[in-house]
Interface confidence: low
């Protein structure tokens, strides 16, 4: 008799793929045409990335540092009208993209939570949650929660409202903290909260250090669902050396949890790479005309359009990874096991029951390395085969689909490999 299939875990929509943050509508759309009507036109692009949710805004009226002139129920007319927002929600729904609204109150000001009137602001947030849930949003994000006194209890209250409306709604909290104790204490009182932090960016970016960061985090948070990002709002390029961008994309998409990206991460957009751009919200490079003030400042290989046409680009890698992440059971909700490999490497397996299994090998080093995979510390349920098929490499030159002998596996500098192999009873 065939072994019984393992029962599938309950899957929420945010478990099924990546979230994509658009913190600045105008910068994302470029050319000054940054309104909700225009964003509706970018949804096909988001579909092509296979992201599951769009973390949008803030969009509400906010007079810098003025509580009285901050209205969490009103969309700033610069972004459009409630009708435009409603149209966006309808279009996103048709394309199976969920919309999460950022309600960080004082987003134009110094202290995102108005340092002096935290309680009245928190009350405003409560009303806003009710209002926007009725309007049809799929969840909320609040950032800089370390600046919110008694953050845990506020978050618990907001999560109750969100989940009380529907278990299918999500609350995301962001913090600049990279301290694991602090992160765990924020998570303790909130069972379904997704927390983005600077935890992974406080790294020496070596294989060993990254492995220990990931395993410590997973151990500390127990069996709860995680999210993976390098910060609560910034671009990957602001935290990573350029040569590790592809490696981190591969890692974020294959760790157990929800990967969270910012607009532009998929093309390697750099903060303030071009003259006159604000650091926190660089203009998205759609095509070579995206930066009209300085002709020639943008080359095709920096843009969405250019990278779409290049199968070896970062964007193509992102699309491939996102596709795998959203359809393979082992990557969707599989178990996670790290194991020993050569110095400078971080290697792990994702597996679920009798489904195809995935092996990830990441070389953080500046030199080519032998993988040196040692499966002795893997449980019997996750043993390694002698060969595995290459799904993708972060570097050009390897043939996708080709079988690789794991004992002889060598990696190029900064190369990451995603390999697949079948379950064997």
């Amino acid at each position: 008799r065939a072994p019984r299939c393992r029962e599938l875990p309950a899957q929420k929509w945010w478990h099924t793929g990546a979230l994509y943050r658009i913190g600045d509508l105008q910068a994302f759309q470029g050319h000054g045409s940054g309104n909700l009507a225009g964003l509706k036109g970018r949804l096909d692009y988001l579909s092509s990335l296979k992201v599951k949710g769009l973390v949008l805004g803030p969009l509400h009226k906010n007079q810098k540092d003025d509580v009285a002139q901050t209205d969490l129920l009103q969309i700033d007319p610069n972004f459009g009208s409630k009708e435009d927002f409603d149209n966006l929600l309808q279009s996103a729904k048709k394309k199976s993209i969920r919309v999460i609204l950022d309600l960080t109150p004082n987003y134009r000001g110094e202290n995102l939570w108005f340092s002096t009137q935290v309680d009245s602001v928190a009350t405003k947030v409560k009303d806003a949650l009710e209002f926007w849930l009725q309007a049809g949003v799929d969840g909320f994000q609040v950032r800089d929660i370390e600046n919110l006194k008694d953050a845990s209890s506020f978050l618990a209250e907001w999560e109750n409202i969100t989940k009380g409306f529907s278990e299918d709604r999500l609350l995301i909290a962001g913090t600049n903290s990279s301290d694991l104790q602090q992160i765990v204490s924020l998570l303790e009182s909130n069972k379904d909260l997704l927390l983005t932090s600077s935890y992974l960016s406080d790294s020496s970016f070596t294989g060993e250090h990254t492995k220990s960061l990931v395993t410590q985090y997973l151990n500390a948070t127990g069996n709860r669902w995680c999210s993976w990002s390098l910060s609560q709002a910034g671009l990957l390029t602001s935290f990573l050396p350029a040569q590790l961008l592809r490696l981190y994309q591969l890692m974020l998409f294959t760790l157990p949890g929800t990967p969270v990206f910012s607009y532009g991460d998929e093309i390697g957009l750099k903060a303030a790479a071009l003259p006159g751009q604000p650091v926190e919200a660089p203009v998205m490079l759609w095509d070579e005309s995206s930066f009209p003030d300085i002709p020639g400042a943008v080359s095709a290989n920096m843009t969405v359009k250019g990278q779409s046409e290049d199968p070896g680009s970062l964007l193509s890698l992102f699309r491939q990874l996102s596709d795998q992440r959203s359809k393979e059971r082992s990557l969707l909700h599989g178990d996670f096991h790290t194991f020993s490999s050569g110095p400078g490497l971080f290697s792990y397996i994702r597996h679920w029951d009798q489904n195809e299994r995935f092996l990830v090998v990441l070389n953080f080093g500046d030199v080519g390395l032998s993988a040196g995979l040692q499966a002795s510390d893997l449980p019997a349920s996750a043993s390694l085969p002698t060969k595995a098929d290459l799904v993708l490499s972060t570097q050009p030159g390897r043939e996708e689909g080709s079988p690789l002998e794991l004992e002889r596996l060598k990696l190029e500098p900064h190369e990451g490999l995603l390999l697949r192999f079948p379950y064997v009873a």
Partner: antibody
Framework: QVQLQQSGAELVRPGVSVKISCKAS????????MHWVKQSHAKSLEWIGV????????TYNQKFKDKATMTVDKSSSTAYLELARLTSEDSAIYYC????????????WGQGTSVTVSS | DIVMTQSQRFMSTSVGDGVRITCKAS??????VAWYQQKPGQSPKALIN???NRHTGVPDRFTARGSGTDFTLTISNVQSEDLADYFC?????????FGAGTKLELK
């Protein structure tokens, strides 16, 4: 090179419908949305609407909501505009024009299809 | 709807001269204005897809300026092949709207 080839001129009676086509070549059809524009002597250029070639979802100018229906056939890289209950007011040249990722202006236009409504 | 006003329906010029065609939006459209050239019996041709970006292959004697509500298309050193209708288009918000057009003729 990029081409948008529209169907030939139509002479039709009032009250009937007409469906005009716009066949795209020289680029990946689903990378660009398709706009439709009306040009008449009386009203110059008027935007009818835009259709996403990827999903087929549409945004119409309210003025044409009950008059025009935009569709696409991805397999033949063709966009269609159907005009219903024609009157002499609908006599005009109708253009298809492609746009990359919807929020830019149209960059390439078809040669136009002349529709004349006359009894 | 946003109204795009091209106040001059006709403009006269001579070959070699410069000319400025204006377009005014009824509300703030940032820089989301495109310009098209149309010759008799032909379809419109993209000149500027967004102030001040020239479309591929458009000669640099065509320049566009403006943001907010006031926009201009300048043609320096006018050539005989530039005699045509010129339309502005706002693509800031739906419905997209065109100006009525300005016809450039020889004096």
């Amino acid at each position: 090179q990029v081409q948008l080839q529209q169907s030939g001129a139509e002479l039709v009676r009032p009250g009937v419908s007409v469906k005009i086509s716009c066949k795209a070549s020289g680029y990946t059809f689903t990378d660009y949305a398709m706009h439709w524009v009306k040009q008449s002597h009386a009203k110059s250029l008027e935007w009818i609407g835009v259709i996403s070639t990827y999903y087929g979802d549409t945004t119409y100018n309210q003025k044409f909501k009950d008059k025009a229906t935009m569709t696409v056939d991805k397999s033949s890289s063709t966009a269609y505009l159907e005009l219903a209950r024609l009157t002499s007011e609908d006599s005009a040249i109708y253009y298809c024009a492609r746009v990359w990722l919807l929020s830019y202006a149209m960059d390439n236009w078809g040669q136009g299809t002349s529709v004349t409504v006359s009894s | 709807d946003i109204v795009m006003t091209q106040s001059q329906r006709f403009m006269s010029t001579s070959v070699g001269d410069g000319v400025r065609i204006t377009c005014k939006a009824s509300q703030n459209v940032r820089t989301a204005v495109a310009w098209y050239q149309q010759k008799p019996g032909q379809s419109p041709k993209a000149l500027i897809n967004l102030a001040p970006n020239r479309h591929t292959g458009v000669p640099d004697r065509f320049t566009a300026r403006g943001s907010g509500t006031d926009f201009t298309l300048t043609i320096s050193n006018v050539q005989s092949e530039d005699l045509a209708d010129y339309f502005c288009l706002q693509h800031w918000n739906y419905p997209l709207t065109f100006g009525a057009g300005t016809k450039l003729e020889l004096k």
